[in-house]
């Protein structure tokens, strides 16, 4: 099966790599603009230069293109705990990330929030914290994992998942409650 090509891709595929079809004259192939620049005017004819201009401050193009406008630089989202790793340049968008000992949680493809890596108190580190994944903890006996923290089995209610892990403790508590003095 032939993949469906959009109009722009169809137009571009007729020209050799690094060139695009002139929008008003499909017999002319114009040279694309370098990254960091955008298309100001199409080339007037074959073998003639495309008029490319450098992106203005606050905008960029990261690859060769024939865009009429540069793309706006992304802003790091302070409300999500993001920090700027590297600032925007004419040929590269802003790079946002998290502080040391934090990881990224992606709520959607293009939205992440920074959270502190778990320290595994009352447990051991099974897998260290990574850029996009929290620490994986293994809890000590008498503790169970809840929201990636090791919580005492004394906080385990019968209705919760922790009952299997905390079964001996729950039985002990139940036994203590049941054994009344006569």
């Amino acid at each position: 099966l032939v993949p469906h090509l959009g109009d722009r891709e169809k137009r571009d595929s007729v020209c050799p790599q690094g060139k695009y079809i002139h929008p008003q004259n499909n017999s002319i192939c114009c040279t694309k603009c370098h990254k960091g620049t955008y298309l100001y005017n199409d080339c007037p004819g074959p073998g003639q230069d495309t008029d490319c201009r450098e992106c203005e401050s606050g905008s960029f193009t990261a690859s060769e293109n024939h865009l009429r406008h540069c793309l706006s630089c992304s802003k790091c989202r302070k409300e999500m705990g993001q920090v700027e790793i590297s600032s925007c340049t004419v040929d590269r968008d802003t790079v946002c990330g998290c502080r040391k000992n934090q990881y990224r949680h992606y709520w959607s493809e293009n939205l992440f929030q920074c959270f502190n890596c778990s320290l595994c108190l009352n447990g051991t580190v099974h897998l260290s914290c990574q850029e996009k994944q929290n620490t994986v903890c293994t809890c000590h006996a008498g503790f169970f994992l809840r929201e990636n923290e090791c919580v005492s089995c004394s906080n385990c209610k019968k209705s919760l998942e922790c009952t299997k892990l905390c079964l001996p403790q729950i039985e002990n508590v139940k036994g203590t409650e049941d054994s009344g003095t006569t």
Partner: nanobody, 119 residues
Framework: EVQLLESGGGLIQPGGSLRLSCAAS????????MVWVRQAPGKGLEWVSH????????YYADPVKGRFTISRDNSRNTLYLQMNSLRSEDTAVYYC????????????RGQGTLVTVSS
């Protein structure tokens, strides 16, 4: 006790508009970034939009960009979601929530309001 109470949902025809509200109490509303998430039938929770404490910075997920507007009134402790040009794929239960701080789960989320977009 933190309470979040959504309202404004209902049955609406494609192309129509709705305004959802979320009344907040039990915490300092003006200190928190607020979020709208939704859950379509048989699907997981989807981030829709959020707004920072002062209402300056907003975010919209791609499927709702240009159609939905999030706002807040800190004097009334209320969060809003204006939904225009509604589509059948917007059918979901809409929840308002406080932006999580400790980890990727919602400690404080409302009971939700159902939005059904159908002709």
């Amino acid at each position: 006790e933190v309470q979040l109470l959504e309202s404004g949902g209902g049955l609406i025809q494609p192309g129509g508009s709705l305004r959802l509200s979320c009344a907040a109490s039990g915490f300092t509303f003006a200190h928190e970034t607020m979020v709208w998430v939704r859950q379509a039938p048989g699907k997981g929770l989807e981030w829709v939009s959020h707004i920072d404490r002062v209402g300056q910075d907003t975010y919209y997920a791609d499927p709702v960009k240009g159609r939905f507007t999030i706002s807040r009134d800190n004097s009334r402790n209320t969060l809003y979601l204006q939904m225009n040009s509604l589509r059948s794929e917007d059918t979901a239960v809409y929840y308002c929530a406080v932006l999580p701080k400790r980890g990727p789960w919602f400690d404080y989320r409302g009971q939700g309001t159902l939005v059904t977009v159908s002709s």
